[in-house]
Structure formats: structure tokens, C-alpha cells
Interface confidence: low
């Protein structure tokens, strides 16, 4: 079999930038690097067929089948694809293999199937067969990571129960407060499920597959900290790890810690200590509380008590199933143009959840950050003065929430007009919702003073893309006022504003909108 | 829902004593833990001294010999005994316990 080409197959996965469906050729694109298909023999085949690795591709995602063939003289190819055949236009690269490319582009479930390559080289022929499926992503998980202690070792180890298996990483700070931010440089990332160093400020431990990033603090009670203004409560589950870290320095090493939950010291097992001198020769002890798997009775006060500090509390609830608590009853904003405001929505919640904040139908990311007292916030800012209906919604596995909010923007009417045979109407969306007059023009009244009181009819409507009111005037049209100029106005705090309609016969009829402050 | 309320604080000389107090709302012979911390102008607060339930007590190493912590169960109340005050003694002092701070009492120690 030495006649047989040397043939590699590689899947390139690409960055979307375009929409199109399988291109048989190179296309420009933002790519990561090949990965190896294999491409071996398949036994007892008839003929020479060559099978790479299957390969799985996310709903919409962008790649390219490649076949590098090294062998002499020119080859010709075709792809067949469900009994359709697909152009082929084989090149050479740098070291003068033959390249051959099927480029799928925005993977849909109709581009799933069997690619086969013919390939007609000078020596032989022979086939090659790729199998592209969309990756079942219903089937994908993320969990939050939890810790474990590793036995025998000082050393906790995180884990997180995840479809595809995660990349577990220790995200860790030395610093308080606003410097351990994710991107800080006193933050330490270590891509390791072991961590053996746990005497820092700030532990973290995330968990990241394609569905995300979830992460787990490691609940610490700092006894050199002066305590908060609200005591600290952590929510666990029934059946979840409960950890707690309390962590002193003191300038010797004469110092003790002990844990108590209702002023009954933790059983043995169920807390280990570790210490070490820092550099400036002070002596750092941590006293590590932990029960395996939570049950309603764990529930109470934790508190880390030493010789030289005073103690401190944690408030450890388990609750059966998560929860988000938050004030869901509708508010109304009224702001002017240019005022600077941000909805936020206060809430308590366990487990974390997931939010976000919805206008007109487009979702915008949702931040949350800690308060103090337990609680959490999330605000949003960025409404660009657009009047209408928000909605913040979050969920975690066992709630959900949604909260509705309405913004109204202070501002002078605009207003626009149309006619026909029978009627005018003149719509208006200034705030607060103005009122309307019509006046007639005519040789008594060339400033138009006369005003129509009859055949007029206002409403409110609500326009349906920002969700927020209009507010429209129509007027009928009787023999009274065929032929006149009209003006309609629309008037509230802020100002007036005009529209003069000429009633004639049907066909165009000429504005001319004035604005009166 | 526990509420400190604190008193007995003022102005005094340097070497002169005060008594504060606190009292709680509700009772206090479970709360393991009673404490005073104080804050001077500009600086952060801190532990001064802290008693158990048993009735054991620790204090700031600043304040060890002159500062005495009591605690009165029946009262639901708390004291501070401050003699030989310094004017570095000068501040807000907060009663706190299980996450509850009081209003605080100012001590002043001119010298």
C-alpha cells in the first residue's frame, strides 16, 4: 500500500463574522488553530475510503473541512453532500500538498449529515468521509463548584459537577475590597483543582465549560476586621458542603481558635486548623468549620472565637429549595431629558442568579454586586433617555423573578399630522401626556383664536415598540370647517406645540407645524 | 431584631473616669458575645473590649488596666468602666453584637 497518498484532515473552528451556507473553498476568515481529524483507513471498505474523526459543531457556529494530500501531480476532487455534488476547487500550499476545503458557514441542523470527498489523484482514487453533528447542548450543565476537603492533606479541593467537563481554576486576592476585582493585577489565577494555600484574603473557585462561568467564594470571617454593620448569612441547601474559614493574625503565636454554632463547640471532624508566619513574622491561623452535606438542624449562628480577638458571627440558613426575594410591584420614573438615573433592583437571593434587564425586546447584560447586609443589586443605566417599559428579570434553578419598571421622559409635545377626506388626527408623545385644542382659521380669526370644540375625539395609545403612550387628537370634518386652515395644538407643562392642516378635498394636504413654547 | 442603645458618654479630663452603658431591647443572656468598639476622627473603628456570657472578658491592649466590661443579664445591659482616660480615648463608641450596632456615645478627653 505504499502508493497510498499521505492524507491529513483537520477541523478549523472560525469566529462568526457572515452567514452563508457550505462554500467549497478557502474563505477569509478570523480562525483558531487546526485540530487533527485522524483521517484513518477504514477497514474491509471497498475501494480506498479514508474516515475522520466525528466531529460535533454548536448550533450557528462557523468551520472548515480541510484535506492536505501529499501526493505527486494534480488532483481533482468533488464533495457530495446528501446526494447533492458541491463544487471542488483543490490548491496547493507552501509545501506543495494539495488542500481541498469545505467551508460551513453558520451551522444549521440541515448541514448536519455525511461530507464525502472524491479525490482523483495521478496514482489513485479514493474517498474520504466526515461526519458533522450538531453538539446537543440541552444536555450541557454548569454547576456552581463546591469544595471538599483532600484527604489526609491540608487542602481543599474544588469541584464542579458539569456537561462538558469544566476548567476548574482558583481565582485569589491579597488585597480588601475594590483591588479584587477579576481583573485586578493583585488577583492570581491557578488552572488547578487543588488548592494548598489557603491563607489569603479573598478564595475563589470557578468552574467554565460553553454554558459559562460560575464561581464559589470561600465564605471567610476575617477575626483583624472590623465587623459589619449586618451580621454576614450564608444560604445553603439541604444535602450542599458547608464551609466556613475564619481566619487571625497575632503577633505571636499565643493565640487559639475555636468554632461554635449556638455556643455548642463544632464535634471533632467537623473543623481542621491550619497556621503559618507571614513575613513579617506574625503568626496567621485559619480555623476551617465544614459539614459534608447540610441538614435543617445545621442551621444557626457560627461563631469564630479567639484568645486574642474578638469573636465574630456568621448566620448559616439551609433552606429546602433556592429562593429570590425582592419587591416585585411595578415603579414609574419620571426624569427629565438629560438627568442622570439608573433603575436597580435590590433582592436576596440563593443560589445566585442569573438576570437581565429587558427594553424593547433587546436584553442587555446584568450586573450584580454584594451590599453589605446580604443583599444584592443590580442596576441599570444605560436607557439612553428612551421612554417606555423595562423589565428586569432573574432566575436560579428553583425561582424566578421579574420586576417591571417605567420611564418617562419630561418633554415639549412634538406633534405630527395626518388628514383624509373625512377627518384629521394629530398625535403628539411629549410627557406628561398633553392636552389638545383645534382652532379654526379664517378671515375672523387670521390667528386662528377660534375654537372647535365639536367633532373632536382624544385618546391614549400606547405605541407598541418602546411601550411607551401617545397621545392622538382627531378631528371629523363638517361642512363648517371644509376648505379652512386648522391648527391643532398639543400643550403640557413644558410647552406648546402646533400643526395647521388645510381641509380641502382629498389628495396631499400641506402642514406647516409651528412651535410655540 | 436586637436594639443598642448607648449612653454615658461626655466631656471629661485627662486622668478622669467615665461609665457607659448599653442597653438592649431584648435579652441579652443568650448573646454569647457583647462588645464596644470606638472610632476617632479620621481613623478606622476598633475593638476595645469584649465579654462573654460566662463572663469572661478581653480588651485592647491601649486600653488593658483602665478599661473594665460588665455585663448586667437582668438589665439586658452592657457597661464600660473607663478610668485614668487618656485624651487619645477620644471617640464615638458603638456597642455591637451578632451584627447590630448602636447609635454610639461620644467621649471626649481634653488635657
Known amino acids: 500500500n505504499q502508493d497510498l497518498p499521505v492524507i491529513k484532515c483537520v477541523l478549523i473552528n472560525h469566529k462568526n463574522n457572515d452567514s452563508s451556507v457550505g462554500k467549497s473553498s478557502s474563505y477569509p476568515m478570523v480562525s483558531e488553530s487546526p485540530e487533527d481529524l485522524g483521517c484513518a483507513l477504514r477497514p474491509q471498505s471497498s475501494g480506498t475510503v479514508y474516515e475522520a474523526a466525528a466531529v460535533e459543531v454548536d448550533v450557528s457556529a462557523s468551520i472548515t473541512l480541510q484535506v492536505l494530500v501529499d501526493a505527486p501531480g494534480n488532483i481533482s476532487c468533488l464533495w457530495v453532500f446528501k446526494h447533492s455534488s458541491l463544487n471542488c476547487q483543490p490548491h496547493f500550499d507552501l509545501q506543495n500538498r494539495g488542500v481541498v476545503s469545505m467551508v460551513i458557514l453558520k451551522m444549521t441542523e440541515t448541514q448536519a449529515g455525511e461530507y464525502l470527498l472524491f479525490i482523483q489523484s495521478e496514482a489513485t482514487n479514493y474517498t474520504i468521509l466526515f461526519t458533522v453533528s450538531i453538539r446537543n447542548t440541552l444536555l450541557y450543565t454548569l454547576r456552581r463548584p463546591y469544595f471538599r476537603k483532600m484527604e489526609n492533606q491540608d487542602a481543599l479541593v474544588c469541584i464542579s459537577e458539569s456537561v462538558p467537563e469544566p476548567i476548574v481554576e482558583w481565582v485569589l486576592c491579597d488585597s480588601q475590597g475594590e483591588s479584587c476585582k477579576e481583573e485586578s493585577p493583585a488577583v492570581v489565577k491557578k488552572e488547578e483543582k487543588v488548592l494548598h494555600e489557603l491563607f489569603g484574603t479573598d478564595i475563589r473557585c470557578c468552574a467554565r465549560n460553553e454554558l459559562g462561568r460560575e464561581c464559589t467564594r470561600l465564605f471567610t470571617i476575617d477575626l483583624n476586621q472590623t465587623p459589619q454593620t449586618t451580621l454576614p448569612q450564608l444560604f445553603l441547601k439541604v444535602g450542599e458542603p458547608l464551609w466556613i474559614r475564619c481566619k487571625a493574625v497575632h503577633v505571636n503565636h499565643g493565640f487559639g481558635l475555636t468554632w461554635e454554632l449556638e455556643n455548642k463547640a463544632l464535634e471533632e471532624g467537623n473543623y481542621f486548623e491550619m497556621s503559618t508566619y507571614s513575613t513579617n513574622r506574625t503568626m496567621i491561623r485559619i480555623l476551617f468549620a465544614f459539614v459534608s452535606s447540610v441538614a435543617r438542624n445545621d442551621t444557626g449562628y457560627y461563631t469564630c472565637s479567639s484568645s486574642k480577638h474578638p469573636s465574630q458571627s456568621a448566620l448559616v440558613t439551609i433552606v429546602e429549595k433556592g429562593f429570590i426575594n425582592a419587591t416585585n410591584s411595578s415603579e414609574d420614573y419620571e426624569i427629565d431629558q438629560y438627568e442622570e438615573f439608573c433603575f436597580s433592583v435590590r433582592f436576596k437571593a440563593y443560589p445566585q442568579i442569573r438576570c437581565t434587564w429587558t427594553f424593547s425586546r433587546k436584553s442587555f447584560p446584568c450586573e450584580q454586586k454584594g451590599l453589605d447586609n446580604g443583599y444584592s443589586i443590580s442596576k441599570f443605566c444605560n436607557h439612553k433617555h428612551q421612554p417606555g417599559e423595562y423589565i428586569f428579570h432573574a432566575e436560579n434553578d428553583d425561582a424566578q423573578f421579574t420586576k417591571m419598571f417605567t420611564l418617562n421622559i419630561r418633554r415639549k409635545p412634538q406633534v405630527l399630522a395626518e388628514a383624509s377626506a373625512s377627518q384629521a388626527s394629530c398625535f403628539s408623545d411629549g410627557y406628561p401626556l398633553p392636552s389638545w385644542t383645534w382652532k379654526k382659521c379664517s378671515d375672523k380669526s387670521p390667528n386662528c383664536t377660534e375654537e372647535i370644540t365639536e367633532g373632536v375625539w382624544n385618546r391614549k395609545a400606547n405605541r407598541k415598540v418602546f411601550g411607551q403612550w401617545v397621545s392622538s387628537s382627531t378631528l371629523n370634518m363638517s361642512e363648517a370647517i371644509k376648505g379652512f386652515l386648522v391648527k391643532c395644538c398639543a400643550y403640557n407643562s413644558l410647552g406648546t406645540s402646533c400643526e395647521t392642516i388645510l381641509l380641502n378635498s382629498p389628495g396631499p394636504f400641506p402642514f406647516i407645524q409651528d412651535n410655540i413654547s | 431584631q436586637v436594639q443598642l442603645q448607648e449612653s454615658g458618654g461626655g466631656l471629661v479630663q485627662a486622668g478622669g473616669s467615665l461609665r457607659l452603658s448599653c442597653a438592649a431591647s431584648?435579652?441579652?443572656?443568650?448573646?454569647?458575645?457583647m462588645n464596644w468598639y470606638r472610632q476617632a476622627p479620621g481613623k478606622q473603628r476598633e475593638s476595645v473590649a469584649w465579654i462573654t456570657s460566662s463572663g469572661s472578658t478581653n480588651y485592647a491592649d491601649s486600653v488593658q488596666g483602665r478599661f473594665t466590661i460588665s455585663r448586667d443579664n437582668a438589665k439586658n445591659t452592657v457597661y464600660l468602666q473607663m478610668d485614668n482616660l487618656k485624651p487619645e480615648d477620644t471617640a464615638v463608641y458603638y456597642c455591637?453584637?451578632?451584627?447590630?450596632w448602636g447609635q454610639g456615645t461620644q467621649v471626649t478627653v481634653s488635657s
Open positions: 431584648g435579652s441579652i443572656s443568650s448573646i454569647r458575645y
Open positions: 455591637y453584637t451578632m451584627g447590630y
